[in-house]
Interface confidence: low
């Protein structure tokens, strides 16, 4: 029986979270399933068979970097019954292929038992084109995160980028939390130089990064597919 | 950067069928997103299809759907459109684009940061 | 699907003024709109995305504003190069869709 690694993740009502999920192999199926309260099987709730959940329709975006062994998941408008037990996987057969456990936990402020937590303050994530931040902390098999809420608390300084057509002092809207297990710390504030780097070594190289149009690897996205292709059941 | 040159337009009769191509470069091909979109003489641009950076995963407009098929061959750096069963309607310049970055899901398409020059199909008996 | 209405149809200015061109969506598209130049004899060129954002290579002197379904793309001052047709595309919902241009002519 394999144990799997296992990823908690934080989020708060109407915010969002991004689920960071290794990606085995090239050209096979991944996806994000949810274990289903007394069945015992991962029902799939986005996959690259192009399938998404109906409850989740409009607010999840499933995203792959091949060269970087990840691929991401990010969940919009967060409700409380978004919170449960989540898994990455990889494969044809959703409750074979598992590679990672995703606790969610969604609530709507923070308890103070997370000001426990032995771990540094983890930076919040920006919804912004240009500027990201990654979680300070991630242990090799289990990951806390905690971000911040929708209206945002606290102060975040001016950042004038080259490419907005107006200058502003950005203020997130939307809360966002990113894991995987076995993550590395880091943070990063890229500089305004339009350089031509891939999105994922923005966002996972130890560096400080520049970034043009191409590289906006988390801009909040919702679409209605009025005409999925296919179907998928649980398994 | 990037650059992508389309070929494989024609003179075709109504009901016919056509294979374009698309030849990309500059970028890594399959970590983008890629598509069609066309554009009838004299009429703005209309957006055809798109497919994933793997290929599993297609869109089309609706006046499309079951008649073209979009594919890509990712060791080659080349995408496709299958045309079948063509019509007047189906007569325009036809541009390869591509999108800032794969994509899947519910969230997921994009503007077109790098067009072809486009290859023209025309549909008439 | 979302339509996209454009206005004017024709812009007639000289070089130097202001340009100041609409896109209306039928129904909200929140911020995600870009706008395309196109050239006669060449493809479209992408100048602004998510509204405000300049593409790689745009100068200053191009903006964009707008959100939900009213939007506009500003050009401050106009040169020989923007003399073009502008179109407008929104990338909320399927179909992906696009406005009938704006054609910017020298008086």
């Known amino acids: 029986l394999r144990i799997l690694p296992e990823v908690k993740v934080e989020g708060e009502l109407g915010g969002s979270v991004t689920i960071k999920c290794p990606l085995p192999e090239m050209h096979v199926r991944i996806y994000l399933c949810r274990e289903m309260a007394g069945s015992g099987t991962c029902g799939t709730v986005v996959s690259t068979t192009n399938f998404i959940k109906a409850e989740y329709k409009g607010r999840v975006t499933l995203k792959q970097y091949p060269r970087k062994n990840l691929f991401l998941v990010e969940v919009t408008q967060l409700t409380e019954s978004d919170s449960g037990v989540y898994a990455c996987g990889a494969g044809m057969n959703t409750d074979r292929g598992k590679t990672q456990k995703v606790t969610l936990n969604v609530h709507s402020e923070y308890e103070p038992s997370w000001e426990e937590q032995p771990m540094p303050e983890t930076p919040k994530w920006f919804h912004l084109p240009y500027l990201f931040q990654m979680p300070a902390y991630a242990s090799s098999s289990k990951f806390v995160t905690r971000v911040t809420t929708p209206a945002q608390r606290g102060k975040v300084p001016p950042v004038h980028h080259s490419s907005p057509t107006t200058q502003i002092t950005h203020r997130p809207r939307v809360s966002r939390a990113s894991s995987v297990a076995g993550d590395k710390p880091r943070t990063f504030l890229p500089s305004t130089t339009a350089s031509k780097i891939s999105a994922l070594e923005g966002l996972l190289k130890p560096q400080t990064p520049s970034y043009n149009h191409h590289t906006r690897l988390h801009r909040q996205r919702a679409l209605d597919y009025g005409s999925q292709s296919g179907r998928e059941g649980q398994g | 950067g990037g650059a992508a040159v389309e070929s494989g337009g024609g003179l075709v009769q109504p009901g016919g069928s056509l294979r374009l191509s698309c030849a990309a470069s500059g970028f890594t091909f399959s970590d983008c997103a890629m598509g069609w979109v066309r554009q009838a003489p004299g009429k703005g641009p209309e957006w055809v299809a798109a497919i994933s950076g793997s290929g599993l995963s297609t869109y089309y407009t609706g006046s499309v759907k079951g008649r073209f098929s979009i594919s890509r061959d990712n060791s080659k750096s080349t995408m496709f459109l299958q045309m079948d069963s063509l019509s007047a309607g189906d007569t325009a310049l036809y541009y390869c684009?591509?999108?800032?970055?794969?994509?899947?899901?519910?969230?997921?398409?994009?503007?077109?940061?790098?067009w072809g020059q486009g290859t023209l199909v025309t549909v008439s008996s | 699907e979302i339509v996209l209405t454009q206005s004017p149809a024709t812009l007639s200015l000289s070089p130097g003024e202001r340009a100041t061109l609409s896109c209306r969506a039928s129904?909200?598209?929140?911020?995600?709109l870009a706008w395309y130049r196109q050239r006669p004899g060449q493809a479209p060129r992408l100048l602004i995305y998510?509204?405000?954002y300049r593409a790689a290579g745009i100068p200053a002197r191009i903006s964009g504003s707008g959100s939900g379904t009213d939007f506009t793309l500003t050009i401050s001052s106009l040169e020989p190069e923007d003399f073009a047709v502008y179109y407008c595309q929104q990338r909320n919902n399927w179909p992906l869709t696009f406005g009938g241009g704006t054609k910017v002519e020298i008086r």
């Open positions: 684009t591509k999108a800032p970055w794969d994509y899947y899901g519910s969230g997921n398409t994009d503007h077109f940061d790098h």
């Open positions: 998510d509204a405000t």
């Open positions: 129904q909200s598209v929140r911020s995600y």
